[in-house]
């Protein structure tokens, strides 16, 4: 049975030409996270492996990186980074756990960050 | 549980325009994840067509762009699949599928044989 | 596109054997691969996701491993239901593409 929860950052807002963090937290549950990915719906952005440790799509190689732990780093973002990604968790012997971020980039300089849920 | 179901023409004539719809119960094709085709040719292999996301985005493989569109009626729970201008080389079973997150295919419909034949 | 290409492409085995299908992609994806199983007339079946995580309810028979561009699905004791088609897929990016099939045939 499935018991852990994820925790995201939620509905979160930067400036264009800024950077985010995007990051998603597995809790209650002793399952072994063996590799999480980062994703839009029609792509990869990156993934991090337990045994092969992270790997960058080339279409982000410039303006994403790595961390912190198990998150993603978007920077030089640009109005067309606004949307849905997600975080996927492949756990053992769970199976799989998943996060959404909704992320908004704004050409204006007023941008908050939302408040913190979670996804069951 | 959800079940996905294909429906429409088991023959098109060439030229004309194939039209498919994927009835969904079990699940709110406005709730979450992406909708998709997927065709398979007799005795060939599988190709993704596109998707339509709940939120209603789309997405084209870049072979078929010019000819195909998925759209969707929410208050039936269906998405729908058209394409135009068909010649012989669309003959194909034609699935509806439901995509995860990532870019795999846990739930599939049982599929549709389309035969273009004038 | 990303082009993937299964080898072989039909395979005759036993009861019990083990059998190994190899997928190839154009370009690194990672572990960003499926593997279904396809039996005629019927829809693909989801069996492993993201190169090595088997499907729920998927059995423990089935495997598969590889990243990069080489991918591997194994099924370590063939039983009679095993005898169908078998297909990689590349879930990195669209548009997402297929292997041409590998047809396990019984010997």
């Known amino acids: 049975m499935m018991t852990g929860t994820i925790e995201t950052t939620g509905n979160i807002s930067a400036e264009k030409g800024g950077s985010i963090i995007l990051q998603c937290h597995l809790s209650s549950t002793t399952a072994q996270v063996t590799q999480v990915n980062w994703e839009q719906q029609d792509q990869l952005l990156a993934i991090c492996n337990a045994d092969l440790g992270w790997h960058i799509s080339p279409s982000f190689k410039d303006r994403v990186a790595p961390g912190p732990g198990l998150g993603l780093t978007l920077q030089s973002l640009t109005v067309n980074d606004t949307g849905e990604y997600f975080c996927i968790y492949h756990t053992y012997p769970d199976g799989t756990y998943t996060g959404r971020i909704f992320l908004e980039v704004l050409e204006s300089s007023v941008a908050e960050h939302g408040a913190r849920f979670q996804i069951p | 549980q959800v079940q996905l179901q294909e429906s429409g023409p088991g023959l098109v004539k060439p030229s004309q325009t194939l039209s498919l719809t994927c009835t969904v119960s079990?699940?709110?094709?406005?709730?979450?994840?992406?909708w998709n085709w997927i065709r398979q040719p007799p005795g060939k292999g599988l190709e993704w067509m596109g998707y339509?996301?709940?939120?209603?985005?789309?997405k084209y493989n870049p072979s078929l762009k010019s000819r195909v569109t998925i759209s969707r009626d929410t208050s039936k729970n269906q998405f729908s699949l058209k394409l135009s201008s068909v010649t012989a080389a669309d003959t194909a079973v034609y699935y509806c599928?439901?995509?995860?997150?990532?870019?795999?295919?846990?739930?599939w419909g049982q599929g549709t044989l389309v035969t273009v034949s004038s | 596109d990303i082009q993937m290409t299964q080898s072989p492409s039909s395979l005759s085995a036993s009861v019990g054997d083990r059998v190994t299908i190899t997928c190839k992609a154009s370009?690194?994806?990672?572990?960003?691969v499926a593997w279904y199983q396809q039996k005629p007339g019927k829809a693909p079946k989801l069996l492993i996701y993201?190169?090595?995580n088997r499907n729920t309810g998927v059995p423990s028979r089935f495997s598969g491993s590889g990243s990069g561009t080489d991918f591997t699905f194994t099924i370590s004791s063939l039983q009679p239901e095993d005898f169908a088609t078998y297909y990689c897929?590349?879930?990195?990016?669209?548009?997402?593409?297929f292997g041409q099939g590998t047809r396990l045939e019984i010997k």
């Open positions: 079990g699940y709110s094709i406005t709730d979450d994840y992406a």
């Open positions: 370009q690194d994806v990672f572990t960003a």
């Open positions: 339509i996301s709940y939120s209603g985005d789309t």
């Open positions: 599928a439901r995509k995860y997150y990532g870019g795999w295919f846990p739930v």
């Open positions: 993201s190169a090595s």
């Open positions: 897929q590349q879930q990195y990016s669209t548009p997402w593409t």
